[in-house]
Interface confidence: low
């Protein structure tokens, strides 16, 4: 499938609109600090060049790789050294090292201002005045803040964003129509970004084999009627798509994703009965729909797994002949029978099975050695079941905010060296597992909860990797992808931690807290809670609850006062003194 000009090939496959959007996303994900206008200029130059190659594939430079073309273009940015420091050194390298260098400098937590949502009238005016610029800005702002966002999926978000403005800017009550849609897109966008970040971490930190194992398990749960060979083909294609997107090859990724969606829809009879509606949709919606499609029903009368994987005299022979294929078949067979298990649990079971065969197939009596392997699965299955049961009970008792607070305290005691904003962000997200998953029946709770927790803990891992401060976090993040959650769950209070010096400034609040949204006010209070635990890691739940209740009462009182600022100053001093006394600071 060699093309004389790769850039012409992708331009023709994707069309001008998608080509330009994907190049803008790629550039914004690499150079996250560059102004919008600079990126638009670069994208327009690349697009004009691509058009010359479409006209004549033999034209000068049209035979260059996309990495070469894009890298050369990025390296023309005049302020590269001043804005990005050592990233400018990437430009001295040759491909493929230059692209690898750019990838290593992607920043998961770029120092960018929080996106402030203007009033609806202002947004609608901007949308009507220049729709193209308005939508490009959306792509740019999301891409630079989420440098691993799944690019073809971002095109789908942009399409929905455009549809929301098209509909709502004509509505009688523009705000009532638009704001809920924008909130939904924001929340879904954050979730999509975090899920993709885990896929990229899986590929980049643990390799293709780890990603393929994840994909076998997930696709086998989703398509339990599909043959193993069919699942294997889908896994290979899906791995290629995500490897490309995670590697910054966004044009190839989007093109291959479209091909995969086409293949799935052409072969849905041998894949899943749930794909019909998805396959009737336009391309971007189709791909999104397939990615989110519900699990198909399990085939009736599936035989016992033990026959092929424990009782058969050929287990070691089959394993020795093609280890990964045999383990893949085990994972496929187990996963299709267990939509009620999380993917990470299925992978733990497969790992246990692999370890057992490695040991037993070298033993004097292999069958005797591995005969009880399925018994080893029981505690692995029960551990997440019990954890989810306990935490859902706690969530139902406390509600989301207080459940988040319980997790904040728990995680701050485990890893107090982690920065307060990271602890707050991660614990708030961990706490959302309650409202997301505890409402589900038993059969759906574990895949919902544990696979969601994997996504959130990956956020902790990538943020911590940027500025490592805790050996315990590094250990849990790097030792095993599938055991991250059990590793963090098993951490006790860090007894080696030296409590933070008390700083009254940390607990000084002002009247501006009164004008914050409920969510922002919660974050302020949760930030204070983390700081309290860092000062007094041995504080009991009861002590912390008393201080937080006092704090909530203090905020409520001063926000109702006529002279708010004076109230915050005077009552704040009293609160700090009372808290110090209550916690023995």
């Amino acid at each position: 499938d060699a093309h004389k000009s790769e850039v012409a090939h992708r331009f023709k496959d994707l069309g001008e609109e998608n080509f330009k959007a994907l190049v803008l996303i790629a550039f914004a994900q690499y150079l996250q600090q560059c102004p919008f206008e600079d990126h638009v200029k670069l994208v327009n130059e690349v697009t004009e060049f691509a058009k010359t190659c479409v006209a004549d594939e033999s034209a000068e430079n049209c035979d260059k790789s996309l990495h070469t073309l894009f890298g050369d273009k990025l390296c023309t940015v005049a302020t590269l050294r001043e804005t990005y420091g050592e990233m400018a050194d990437c430009c001295a390298k040759q491909e493929p090292e230059r692209n690898e260098c750019f990838l290593q400098h992607k920043d998961d937590n770029p120092n960018l201002p929080r996106l402030v949502r203007p009033e609806v009238d202002v947004m609608c005016t901007a949308f009507h005045d220049n729709e193209e610029t308005f939508l490009k800005k959306y792509l740019y702002e999301i891409a630079r803040r989420h440098p691993y966002f799944y690019a073809p999926e971002l095109l789908f978000f942009a399409k929905r964003y455009k549809a929301a403005f098209t509909e709502c800017c004509q509505a009688a009550d523009k705000a009532a129509c638009l704001l809920p849609k924008l909130d939904e897109l924001r929340d879904e966008g954050k979730a999509s970004s975090a899920k993709q970040r885990l896929k990229c971490a899986s590929l980049q930190k643990f390799g293709e084999r780890a990603f393929k194992a994840w994909a076998v398990a997930r696709l086998s749960q989703r398509f339990p009627k599909a043959e193993f060979a069919e699942v294997s083909k889908l896994v290979t294609d899906l791995t290629k798509v995500h490897t490309e997107c995670c590697h910054g090859d966004l044009l190839e990724c989007a093109d291959d994703r479209a091909d995969l969606a086409k293949y799935i829809c052409e072969n849905q009879d041998s894949i899943s009965s749930k794909l019909k509606e998805c396959c009737e949709k336009p391309l971007l919606e189709k791909s999104h729909c397939i990615a989110e499609v519900e699990n198909d029903e399990m085939p009736a009368d599936l035989p016992s797994l033990a026959a092929d994987f424990v009782e058969s005299k050929d287990v070691c022979k089959n394993y020795a002949e093609a280890k990964d294929v045999f383990l893949g078949m085990f994972l496929y067979e187990y996963a299709r029978r267990h939509p009620d298990y999380s993917v990470v649990l299925l992978l733990r079971l497969a790992k246990t099975y692999e370890t057992t065969l490695e040991k037993c197939c070298a033993a004097a009596d292999p069958h005797e050695c591995y005969a009880k392997v399925f018994d080893e699965f029981k505690p692995l299955v029960e551990e997440p079941q019990n954890l989810i049961k306990q935490n859902c009970e706690l969530f139902e008792q406390l509600g989301e905010y207080k459940f988040q607070n319980a997790l904040l305290v728990r995680y701050t005691k485990k890893v107090p060296q982690v920065s307060t904003p990271t602890l707050v962000e991660v614990s708030r997200n961990l706490g959302k597992v309650g409202s997301k998953c505890c409402k589900h029946p038993e059969a759906k709770r574990m895949p919902c909860a544990e696979d969601y927790l994997s996504v959130v803990l990956n956020q902790l891992c990538v943020l911590h990797e940027k500025t490592p401060v805790s050996d315990r976090v590094t250990k849990c993040c790097t030792e095993s992808l599938v055991n991250r959650r059990p590793c963090f769950s098993a951490l006790e209070v860090d007894e080696t931690y030296v409590p933070k010096e008390f700083n009254a400034e940390t607990f000084t609040f002002h009247a501006d807290i009164c004008t914050l949204s409920e969510k922002e006010r919660q974050i302020k209070k949760q930030t204070a809670l983390v700081e309290l635990v860092k000062h007094k890691p041995k504080a009991t739940k009861e002590q912390l609850k008393a201080v937080m209740d006092d704090f909530a009462a203090f905020v409520e009182k001063c926000c109702k006062a006529d002279d708010k600022e004076t109230c915050f100053a005077e009552e704040g001093k009293k609160l700090v003194a009372a808290s110090q006394a209550a916690l023995g600071l």
Epitope: E119, M123, A126, D129, N130, K137
Partner: nanobody
């Protein structure tokens, strides 16, 4: 840190003109819509005018339409409000804000505009 520094206010007679400026720093000015908000004594804040990031869209309160003009210079990180045909009811502290919030975005003190004969 976001900084917004308003200037250009003062005492002016009814029918007179003033030009307010707002110097912005600490964020990428050219990427945000901006607004002018005013607060008269014993009254809540009122959005006077807003402008999109690339100046393509502007909005005015009914009370100032035809008299006030909002503009911006992204190269200079500055927002402007040209106020003509001023009336006593325009007397207020004027703030600039990011987006079109009526809550001041930075620690700016605002600039006092007094219209009186």
């Amino acid at each position: 840190q976001v900084q917004l520094v308003e200037s250009g206010g003062g005492l002016v007679q009814p029918g007179g003109s003033l030009r307010l400026s707002c110097a912005a720093s600490g964020f990428t000015f050219g990427q945000f819509g901006m607004s002018w908000v005013r607060q008269a004594p014993a009254k809540g804040p009122e959005r006077v005018s807003a402008i999109s990031s690339d100046s393509s869209g502007t909005i005015y309160a009914d009370s100032v339409k035809g008299r006030f003009t909002i503009s911006r210079d992204n190269a200079k990180n500055t927002l402007y409000l040209q106020m003509n045909s001023l009336k006593p009811e325009d007397t207020a502290v004027y703030y600039c804000t990011i987006g079109s919030s009526t809550t001041p975005s930075g620690p700016g003190q605002g600039t006092q505009v007094t219209v009186s004969s």
